[in-house]
Amino acid sequence: LRLLDHRALVCSQPGLNCTVKNSTCLDDSWIHPRNLTPSSPKNIYINLSVSSTQHGELVPVLHVEWTLQTDASILYLEGAELSVLQLNTNERLCVRFEFLSKLRHHHRRWRFTFSHFVVDPDQEYEVTVHHLPKPIPDGDPNHQSKNFLVPDCEHARMKVTTPCMSSGSLWDPNITVETLEAHQLRVSFTLWNESTHYQILLTSFPHMENHSCFEHMHHIPAPRPEEFHQRSNVTLTLRNLKGCCRHQVQIQPFFSSCLNDCLRHSATVSCPEMPDTPEPIPDYMPLWEPRSGSSDYKDDDDKGSSHHHHHH
């Protein structure tokens, strides 16, 4: 959570002289309350936009827009404090609009915008616009808050941003999975243009259940340059468990730009339309124990075998 680096932050508009300042998120009016305070913002609108930094990186930013109520309290409006709170980390960033001239009623509703909060993919935020000065203790609140969920890197708009490209967002593996006879799955995907290894993580589930009945990890060595963008085919042998028929295949790349934290892609094979009466699945010990990271699988090839080749 940061401010876009190179922009001269401007909030002036016809009829208003205004400057944007960094804020500690603790406006002076908290400590020294005023008798007359403005009403709250009327409508806050937030959307996602993409901007470039002075280093030429494309970053996701929040575009915040709000309007004023058409009441006499605008005569006492001295500015606004914009605050963005990242919900998980509790990190907060604020800026202050400082009005250098008095607001007057004019033929259009006053509208303000700010598009300089740089945010992270797949994170949740609360945006608050607080009119200044803040109200006296027990006074009516004069702020409004809205939540915003920044999409993850699979979202079309986010794919092209620098943080997403660094985690491998441009790679489209176009995974296909087909069920073969003799309890086998054939997985095919497109390799990226980097000499890096991949892992295929197979998790199988009973029909209509969310707890796994089989897990298997398969390692794919780094392809040679002539194999870049080619299809890689892998045949995985499943555990012979009746009813363990829904298979999720996840492919984890290890690109140099993101190492263990690259975006994973997955595909799912559903159970057959008319499953047999499922037999009870025996208690099953996972083949891997989740640790604290996001790529916590360990190989155990004696429980399910596999082989692969790259196809040109």
Epitope: I46, N88, N147, L149, S292, S294
Partner: antibody
């Protein structure tokens, strides 16, 4: 594979407290918040609040303020929800779920029955 | 708090047909809407967030239209595994609130 596994069913008397646990695996607990949602028998879903395992910050629904406490233990990747002064209308399935806005992975639910 | 209203309460559809579920918010929530699917005895599953972004692993037959106060979840061709209860949820402001649900049953 992200999984949230909750503790087993509980039967409690009115006025008692219940503490439901939610063990996370397949991801780092501190990377996302944990929300708690309940569902009375045959009813809809009701949001109770959330906790950030990263910061310890909490936000509770006003209805449960003063009666609920959400905590986490990062060493065991477990989140907890304690509800006190139980009443018969607290009988419900209690779910933990990952994230604070759109809840992307859910636990299997814990049935809490409040009956004298 | 924002009240979410879903209609119809029950929708009877034949497999292969299109299902259209409606969700209305009592005030504008922009695109801050999620849809969940719940089957008997199971936890809800996230289908869509941001009013139109499908969650990981959710098939393309699920789509949402709308922003502001009116939203529609469309299932283009119902499969047997799609018969369930569907809830909408707003996350625009606290508290998070859910609709009462729409049960999609086999005709």
């Amino acid at each position: 594979q992200v999984q949230l596994v909750q503790s087993g069913a509980e039967v409690k008397k009115p006025g008692a407290s219940v503490k439901v646990s939610c063990k996370a695996s397949g991801y780092t607990l501190t990377s996302y918040g944990i929300s708690w949602v309940r569902q009375a028998p045959g009813q809809g879903l009701e949001w109770m609040g959330w906790i950030s395992a990263y910061s310890g910050n909490t936000k509770y629904a006003q209805k449960f303020q003063g009666r609920v406490t959400m905590t986490t233990d990062t060493s065991t990747s477990t989140a907890y929800m304690e509800l006190r002064s139980l009443r018969s209308d607290d009988t419900a399935v209690y779910y933990c779920a990952r994230r604070q806005l759109a809840l992307d992975y859910w636990g299997q639910g814990t049935l809490v029955t409040v009956s004298s | 708090e924002i009240v979410m209203t879903q209609s119809p309460a029950t929708l009877s559809v034949s497999p292969g047909e299109r299902a259209t579920l409606s969700c209305r918010a009592s005030q504008s929530i922009s695109s801050n809407l999620a849809w969940y699917q719940q089957k008997p005895g199971q936890a809800p599953r996230l289908l869509i967030y941001g009013a139109s972004t499908r969650a990981t692993g959710i098939p393309a037959r699920f789509s949402d239209n709308g922003s502001g106060t009116e939203f529609t979840l469309t299932i283009s061709s119902l499969q047997s595994e799609d018969f369930a209860v569907y809830f909408c949820q707003q996350y625009d402001t606290w508290p998070l609130t859910f609709g009462g649900g729409t049960k999609v049953e086999i005709k």
